[in-house]
Amino acid sequence: LIIGFGISGRHSITVTTVASAGNIGEDGILSCTFEPDIKLSDIVIQWLKEGVLGLVHEFKEGKDELSEQDEMFRGRTAVFADQVIVGNASLRLKNVQLTDAGTYKCYIITSKGKGNANLEYKTGAFSMPEVNVDYNASSETLRCEAPRWFPQPTVVWASQVDQGANFSEVSNTSFELNSENVTMKVVSVLYNVTINNTYSCMIENDIAKATGDIKVTESEIKRRSHLQLLNSKAS
């Protein structure tokens, strides 16, 4: 969390941003909030990016003002217009690109004063893994697949019964480049698995950590997966 204050002028307002990550090819949110002001006509929101000449986005007098917008963001940005009045200056970024990563500034003017805060935005690819029993294998084998990751992640297997065990000798992980030549499909195979045990396939890079669990018993198979972004720090 980054909290910024206005530095010049008589009044300053608090502006708060949260560092976040964008999943390339999908829509992302650059989070920014400020002290609410009911007078919409006085609110100005400017999003700027370090190293970019034009604006990322500008909202003033109750509407988007995009005459100064940089070409790389053309047609890809929007604020939540109905939420501005309650202090939400967050930016929706469509079709996140790898090159969208960097330092952004959320700059706010209201009838109460001015303020700004910076935001670190990381970009990459992350997806939920799915763990299945590989019935085609000669021995009891689990197959963990996740369709899109970038940068290349690490894959670690764990088991509830054998806590702390190192499965690197009995697993094999491969990375297959996807058609857009950036993201990769992750496939990891775990051999010699035992029944009545819960196994976890953990995929992690510097942006996200995802886990796929599978519990195999004689009567049923239970699966669960979750994904966590690693750099959600507010400022």
Epitope: I38, E61, K63, Q83, I85, V86
Partner: antibody
Framework: QLQLQESGPGLVKPSETLSLTCTVS??????????WSWIRQPPGKGLEWIGS???????YYNPSLKSRVTISVDTSKNQFSLKLSSVTAADTAVYYC?????????WGQGTMVIVSS | DIQMTQSPSSLSASVGDRVTITCRAS??????LNWYQQKPGKAPKLLIY???SLQSGVPSRFSGSGSGTDFTLTISSLQPEDFATYYC?????????FGGGTKVEIK
């Protein structure tokens, strides 16, 4: 779902202070940023915004009523209140409380207040 | 204050009719225009916000358009339950102000 309920006396004497409370149920008044608002409607007439409050305590009043209005919030009771001083017969109306972002999306049922001696 | 002028103040229509109500602001309010429906003895109900966004649960026969100073509420095919009074409201600048209302009556 979220519900708002106005309460207070239905009859107020001229020159006295009108006091109403809005109780929020089905959700916390401080769970998100909203303008907790008061609107009134004289019999057979249109709607008039009285004012709004944020849980931070920031208040916004209609300039036509500003000198007579106080809106306050009590997060511990999940309530916000309206006080309108020095009332006259012109303040006779149905008083509504409502939740707003840039639109008033949840309203109380309204309470009729008559100013009469 | 921003004045909101609604027209007509009343209209008579039949079930199935297409009904249009207009609202004009005394200055530009961007798209910060909301529409409400009120039935006798009841609180207003939000229909349209941000000039054209349909509030959740509101039938799709209701639609809104416009920006700046001129706005329209359209009911594509009037239903028996639509006979009510309709108000526009701006939230661009305080004080928030409402139009005078349009009463839709049965012909």
């Amino acid at each position: 779902q979220l519900q708002l309920q106005e309460s207070g006396p239905g009859l107020v004497k001229p020159s006295e202070t009108l006091s109403l409370t809005c109780t929020v149920s089905g959700g916390s008044i401080s769970s998100s940023v909203y303008y907790w608002s008061w609107i009134r409607q004289p019999p057979g007439k249109g709607l008039e915004w009285i004012g709004s409050i944020l849980v931070s305590g920031s208040t916004y009043y209609n300039p036509s009523l500003k000198s007579r209005v106080t809106i306050s919030v009590d997060t511990s009771k999940n309530q916000f209140s309206l006080k309108l001083s020095s009332v006259t017969a012109a303040d006779t109306a149905v008083y509504y409380c409502a939740r707003a972002v840039s639109f008033l999306d949840v309203w109380g049922q309204g309470t009729m207040v008559i100013v009469s001696s | 204050d921003i004045q909101m002028t609604q027209s007509p103040s009343s209209l008579s229509a039949s079930v199935g009719d297409r009904v249009t109500i207009t609202c004009r602001a005394s200055q530009s309010i961007s798209s910060y225009l909301n529409w409400y429906q009120q039935k006798p003895g009841k609180a207003p109900k939000l229909l349209i916000y941000g000039a054209s966004s349909l509030q959740s649960g509101v039938p799709s026969r209701f639609s809104g358009s416009g920006s700046g100073t001129d706005f329209t509420l359209t009911i594509s095919s009037l239903q028996p339950e639509d006979f009510a009074t309709y108000y526009c409201q701006q939230s661009y600048d305080p004080p928030w102000t409402f139009g005078g209302g349009t009463k839709v009556e049965i012909k």
